[in-house]
């Protein structure tokens, strides 16, 4: 019995279906086919879980969280024992193993391994201002998404016709910050933060209002 090499890893957007491949060759009839799919979740590597089981001509559910979402892609028994996972969740990310036994065929490689990564687009980022908005001050524009896999990068723009940040601004696209030094009236306006990763983008807008000093009456 020989389980075929599978692609190292599969990436899928959260909520979309994933197909985890596993095929094998055997010299025996498929009368005593026994297939166990296991997962070692990334979130809990010490706790492997059963995903689905085929034994004695019957299918059995694995861990409750997979109930109703998992099945074999083809009619069993077969030499293609790939499975699908519908409505993928972040917690489905992990290393999946198919363990195949087909007595009396023994020996050879009977395990196939596939990594599954569930990707999540950036959630609506939160835009905020840190620091005094008085003229001449330094301010930091902050942008962060609570969710996003891979980790989002952040691009700030000023929504004027140049789409450029003020000349005194420095941007950190990893941290999602823009530091604007010595703000002036020209720094005022609408700023856009675009959070993006491999599968999506999301934005927030921020309204920076630079406060000019009030003229004092000399009396």
């Amino acid at each position: 019995l020989e389980v075929s090499e599978s692609p190292g890893s599969i990436q899928v957007a959260r909520g979309q279906p994933a197909v985890l491949p596993c095929t094998f060759t055997t010299s025996a009839a498929l009368i005593n086919l026994n297939v166990i799919w296991m997962v070692t979740p990334l979130s809990n590597a010490n706790q492997p879980e059963q995903v689905i089981l085929y034994q004695g001509g019957q299918m059995f559910d694995g861990a409750p969280r997979f109930h109703g979402r998992v099945g074999f892609t083809g009619t069993m028994p077969a030499t293609n024992v790939s499975i699908f996972i519908n409505n993928t969740q972040l917690s489905d990310t992990g290393t999946y193993q198919c363990l195949v036994n087909n007595l009396p065929d023994i020996g050879g490689r009977n395990i196939g391994v596939t990594g599954l990564t569930v990707l999540v687009p950036p959630s609506a980022p939160h835009c905020q201002i840190q620091g005094s908005q008085d003229i001449g001050s330094d301010v930091i524009l902050l942008c962060s998404s609570e969710e996003g896999i891979p980790r989002p990068t952040y691009l700030w723009e000023k929504l004027d016709n140049t789409l450029k940040l003020p000349p005194t601004a420095t941007q950190d696209q990893v941290q999602g910050t823009v530091t604007i030094r010595n703000i002036s009236a020209l720094s005022s306006g609408l700023y856009q933060c675009v959070a993006s990763n491999a599968i999506g983008t999301s934005t927030c807008l921020l309204d920076l209002q630079v406060i000019s000093p009030q003229p004092r009456n000399i009396g």
Epitope: C127, L190, L205
Partner: antibody, heavy 123, light 110 residues
Framework: QVQLQESGPGLVKPSQTLSLTCTVS??????????WSWIRQHPGKGLEWIGY???????YYNPSLKSRVTISVDTSKNQFSLKLSSVTAADTAVYYC???????????????WGQGTLVTVSS | QSVLTQPPSASGTPGQRVTISCSGS????????VNWYQQLPGTAPKLLIS???NRPSGVPDRFSGSKSGTSASLAITGLQAEDEADYYC???????????FGGGTKLTVL
């Protein structure tokens, strides 16, 4: 409560420049946090954002119209204006001025709007 | 052609519940908030729903908004004759870096 009122010619010849003014009453155009916008509605069709101006004079235009649009502000008159050059029949529309503000939102909204003025481009 | 897609018309009888859909893409509705405007005959559009599901003061609670994925919808319960109007959805488009609208839905109260 802020109110907006558009004014300007209702008929413009092709290739000429469309000019409209929006007068703001019930509040100051120099109030921070408001972006004074122009939006148009072609006959029987949807709405199209044209651009905005901040009281400081900073402008931002719809990229599809950017080459022909100029928006300016006159804080002393509490007015802002739209100029659209090289007009064609496709620019025939009802033109609205509106105030956009971010509020506590991620993306803001337009409120209030002027009552709109129909501009026809025809020779 | 509008960036956001709405059905051109919808109708209902007084007291009925009517929904108006608004379909977009991942760069607008999919990742940003949606506003709805009501345009009564011969008047300017008026903000009806902001931030997907918030009603400004003065808007009856018969109007509600929702958003799922790249689509949004406006629901009107207990339809009344004065609800006959054009309804527009609007969002921000991250790719265009600008505000986009739907083509509008004309609601007729039968």
């Amino acid at each position: 409560q802020v109110q907006l009122q558009e004014s300007g010619p209702g008929l413009v010849k092709p290739s000429q420049t469309l000019s409209l003014t929006c007068t703001v009453s019930g509040g100051s155009i120099s109030s921070g946090g408001y972006y004074w916008s122009w939006i148009r509605q072609h006959p029987g069709k949807g709405l199209e954002w044209i651009g905005y101006i901040y009281y400081s004079g900073s402008t931002y235009y719809n990229p599809s119209l950017k080459s022909r649009v100029t928006i300016s502000v006159d804080t002393s008159k509490n007015q802002f204006s739209l100029k659209l050059s090289s007009v064609t029949a496709a620019d025939t529309a009802v033109y609205y001025c509106a105030s956009w503000s971010l509020g506590t939102s991620n993306h803001g909204w337009f409120d209030p709007w002027g009552q709109g003025t129909l501009v026809t481009v025809s020779s | 052609q509008s960036v956001l897609t709405q059905p051109p018309s919808a109708s209902g009888t007084p007291g009925q519940r009517v929904t108006i859909s608004c379909s977009g893409s991942s760069s607008n509705i999919g990742s940003n908030t949606v506003n709805w405007y009501q345009q009564l005959p011969g008047t300017a559009p008026k903000l009806l729903i902001s931030d997907n599901n918030n009603r400004p003061s003065g808007v009856p609670d018969r109007f509600s908004g929702s958003k799922s994925g790249t689509s949004a919808s406006l629901a009107i319960t207990g339809l009344q004759a004065e609800d006959e109007a054009d309804y527009y959805c609007q969002s921000y488009d991250s790719n265009l870096s600008g505000w986009v609208f739907g083509g509008g839905t004309k609601l007729t109260v039968l």
